[in-house]
């Protein structure tokens, strides 16, 4: 029960985290204009990974995409890559984890397979979360560096004639969304890995032992499966680690592909 809960919670937390990573990646407010130096600006600038925006005094917002690849800073490209890798890994992880969920039966999938899938998805979520956190942190570091550089050189001349205050940028909402989402995905991944341990069938330490009785011969072998049917039909030997507690007889009944318990 605890394993199912841990796995289910891990899945939900990861799902929320990946949704957050996607949201952060799409958001325009990765960096926002620092208003400390110019609190009365009628023109508010903010930038995302894909476009930069300006909100004017009219309330009108104009956004322009970065219609170049080569002209963009390498760091921005790296952040984009990290976020996309995080989303892709997370999406695959979600897909894998759906089939790995203990509460969902798919055919006669072995629990060992579910355990492996749970571990795989958990690792994917961990890497996805780390990618998002890394991406956001790289961008934040880039902002801090640029912020202090522009502070040191606050006034830049336009053609040596006009003195204009250089726009400084600070952390936007997307950074906080990204950090939280990455953290959630990471936590979800760890929970999936923990759940995997509970799902994996424990190895028995005893060897196969043959018991000889008069009239009937039954060999009990490790793994919990009946070797013969000598004791009659009312004896049903169950796999102790099967959440669905399915018997041999049930295996023969060809369950539907998705049998929800």
């Amino acid at each position: 029960m605890a394993v199912t809960a841990c796995q289910g919670l891990g899945f939900v937390v990861s799902l929320i985290g990946i949704a957050g990573i996607i949201a952060a990646t799409c958001m325009d407010q990765w960096s926002t204009q620092d208003l400390y130096n110019n609190p009365v600006t009628a023109v508010f600038n903010y930038q995302g990974l894909w476009r930069s925006c300006v909100r004017e005094s009219s309330g009108f917002t104009e956004c322009r995409g970065y219609f170049t690849l080569l002209g963009l800073p390498a760091m921005l490209q790296a952040v984009r890559a990290l976020m996309i890798v995080g989303i892709v890994l997370g999406a695959i992880g979600l897909l894998v984890s759906i089939f790995a969920l203990k509460c969902i039966r798919i055919g006669s999938m072995e629990d060992s397979a579910k355990a492996n899938m749970t571990l795989t998805s958990g690792i994917m979520f961990i890497v996805s979360g780390l990618c998002a956190i890394a991406g956001v942190s790289v961008f934040a570091n880039m902002l801090v560096t640029n912020f202090w550089m522009s502070t040191a050189n606050m006034y830049t001349g336009m053609g040596g004639m006009v003195q204009t205050v250089q726009t400084r940028y600070t952390f936007g909402a997307a950074l906080f969304v990204g950090w939280v989402a990455g953290g959630l995905t990471l936590i979800g991944g760890v929970m999936m890995c923990i759940a995997c341990r509970g799902l994996a069938p424990e190895e028995t330490n005893y060897k196969a032992v043959s018991y000889h009785a008069s009239g009937h011969s039954v060999a009990y072998k490790p793994g919990g499966f009946k070797a013969s049917t000598g004791f009659g039909s009312n004896t049903k030997n169950k796999k102790i680690y099967d959440g669905g507690a399915r018997t041999e007889d049930e295996v023969q009944s060809y369950p539907s592909k998705h049998d929800y318990v």
Epitope: T41, A42, V43, S52, E56, S58, F60, E62, R64, Q163
Partner: antibody, heavy 115, light 113 residues
């Protein structure tokens, strides 16, 4: 087409308050800020402030901060500007304006402050 | 507050001639975020509200004749009417659209010579 229709002329006594309305049509009312500008007879233009009907946020010229109040009613796409403690030098035509670069203006409301 | 200074106060130009007026701001109106200058030009005729001509220093509003053009950057801006028509007689205002409070120039009165 975009239209801003303002309320009619008002005559007020010094110390009184006036509330001018600006009914918008032809665009999504909550998408743009509504600015208020006044023009004293034979004088230039003076910005009073704006209201964002979308979130109710506002920004005032410090000169009017303690006397001007801007509100909006999104259900009837109308913005209001109330000016209290009127003085004789508040006699002016009050305009509402919106759109990019203040592309659209109301016809103006003449407020006369006289004892 | 940004102070907007227009010159000349009044201007008389013959029909068909070029009319040029200036607007200077006490601070730069240049926004480095999108490399645009936030200055607006209006035309106002007696008894009417101002009419938008140019925004962002050089972008003509829709429906404005192409004889009107705006130029300049930073603190110095110019409105040019390439060939003056009788209907262009009006007062022209420039406005700071970059920083609150939004401020207007004193206006340039354009007349026919």
């Amino acid at each position: 087409q975009v239209q801003l229709v303002q309320s009619g002329a008002e005559v007020k006594k010094p110390g009184a308050s006036v509330k001018v309305s600006c009914k918008a049509s032809g665009f999504t009312f909550t998408s743009y800020n509504i600015h208020w500008v006044r023009q004293a007879p034979g004088q230039g233009l003076e910005w009073i402030g704006y209201i964002s009907p979308g979130n109710g946020g506002s920004n005032y010229n410090l000169k009017f901060k303690d006397r001007a109040t801007m509100t909006s009613d999104t259900s009837i796409s109308t913005a209001y500007m109330e000016l209290s403690r009127l003085r004789s030098d508040d006699t002016a035509v009050y305009f509402c304006a919106t759109g990019r670069g203040f592309a659209y203006w109301g016809q103006g409301t003449l407020v006369t402050v006289s004892s | 507050d940004i102070v907007m200074t227009q010159s000349p106060d009044s201007l008389a130009v013959s029909p068909g001639e070029r009319a040029t007026m200036s607007c200077k701001s006490s601070q730069s109106l240049f926004n480095s975020g999108n490399q645009k200058n936030y200055l607006i030009w209006y035309q106002q005729k007696p008894g009417q509200p101002p009419k938008l001509l140019i925004y962002r220093a050089s972008t003509r509003d829709s429906g404005v004749p192409d004889r009107f053009s705006g130029s300049g950057s930073g603190t110095d801006f110019t409105l040019t009417i390439s060939s003056l028509q009788a209907e262009d007689v009006a007062v022209y205002y420039c406005q700071n659209d970059y920083s609150y409070p939004l401020t207007f120039g004193g206006g340039t009165k354009l007349e026919i010579k």
